[in-house]
């Protein structure tokens, strides 16, 4: 009676249970009544990560520097290459299939949270009393200069993009 189902790590072909190829190897020929399954190791830069009956190994993933990617872990015959983002870039999704440059915070905004490899820069508007006059992925909002502590007075008010301008106090005329 020919089998209708096979054991784990086997597959059914021509009414016969054949052994699957182990990870790192591809199928060359199915087993027969007289021969075992024939498997061959995957070539350089190829892999198969499961017990399989694939006739071709998969190419290792290419960590494309044009997409901000670099190799985190080199692939083997049984594992794929793992990519991560270059310094200054972060993943566009959890799967990290591509990266983008960290965003800079525009003038009038400061960095609330510096970016990581998986999350972008978080910016916040500079509140009253603070300013940022640069586009930066690192700079926080800076407090306006305190003219009083320098024995000066405010000659020009500050904004969210500019510091106050201090000047000497008007001398009282005699």
């Amino acid at each position: 009676e020919p089998p209708t189902a096979c054991r784990e790590k086997q597959y059914l072909i021509n009414s016969q249970c054949c052994s699957l190829c182990q990870p790192g190897q591809k199928l060359v020929s199915d087993c027969t009544e007289f021969t075992e399954t024939e498997c061959l190791p995957c070539g350089e830069s190829e892999f198969l990560d499961t017990w399989n009956r694939e006739t071709h190994c998969h190419q290792h993933k290419y960590c494309d520097p044009n997409l901000g990617l670099r190799v985190q872990q080199k692939g083997t015959s049984e594992t794929d290459t793992i990519c991560t983002c270059e310094e200054g870039w972060h993943c566009t999704s959890e799967a990290c299939e591509s990266c983008v440059l960290h965003r800079s915070c525009s003038p009038g905004f400061g960095v609330k949270q510096i970016a990581t490899g998986v999350s972008d820069t978080i910016c916040e508007p500079c509140p009253v009393g603070f300013f940022s006059n640069v586009s930066s992925a690192f700079e926080k909002c800076h407090p306006w200069t305190s003219c009083e502590t320098k024995d000066l007075v405010v000659q020009q008010a500050g904004t969210n993009k500019t510091d106050v301008v201090c000047g000497p106090q008007d001398r009282l005329r005699a």
């Epitope: 990560d49 071709h56 998969h58 190419q59 993933k61 044009n66 997409l67 901000g68 794929d80 566009t92 999704s93 959890e94 799967a95 299939e97 591509s98 983008v100 440059l101 960290h102 965003r103 972008d120």
Partner: antibody
Framework: EVTVKESGPVLVKPTETLTLTCTVS????????VSWIRQPPGKALEWLGG???????YYASWAKSRLTISRDTNLKQVVLTMTNMDPVDTATYYC??????????WGQGTLVTVSS | AFQLTQSPSSLSASVGDRVTITCQAS??????LAWYQQKPGKPPKLLIV???NLASGVPSRFSGSGSGTDFTLTISSLQPEDFATYYC??????????FGGGTKVEIK
Amino acid sequence: EVTVKESGPVLVKPTETLTLTCTVSGFSLSSYGVSWIRQPPGKALEWLGGIGSDGSAYYASWAKSRLTISRDTNLKQVVLTMTNMDPVDTATYYCARGGITVYAMWGQGTLVTVSS
Amino acid sequence: AFQLTQSPSSLSASVGDRVTITCQASQSISSGLAWYQQKPGKPPKLLIVGASNLASGVPSRFSGSGSGTDFTLTISSLQPEDFATYYCQSYFSSSSTVFGGGTKVEIK
């Protein structure tokens, strides 16, 4: 050889559910995501959604309520289900390798017509 | 909702012309922009990734520039095989994965 190929019905009636399958070869769905993009006749490309290599599904905000994208890594298939089809959904539906990324590898596309 | 606005929607040009297509994002997408070329009855072909990097096998007459919200695709000297429709695509995040409306480049 790395390929992606769409299959499914060419004609769907209004209000029916569309099910399209993207069968991949030459790469593992555990290594790469797959996205669905459509193009109505004479119009622009529209990203519908995708599934990442980690199995996370993503959808265009306008299509979220009607779409489901799932995968079977063993069968090497990604399935798009779109409910409540309307004549305005008539389009060429493409699958492409990649989740939230760029798409260097596309299928030839399958034209789906919605008509009673 | 996030939008990518491409302009012009069509243009007429001659072989040898310098052609410029722009794409504007409704919010910053950093460097997360790609450009594609599509010919009738065919799937799109990837030209530019990361806003300015040429995809594999793409001729050097194509170039991309920009970051944040404003991006440009330039064809330095238009060739007969370049008459096609061009699309920009953002991939900054899942909520901003969108294609532009397309630019059809026709023979003058």
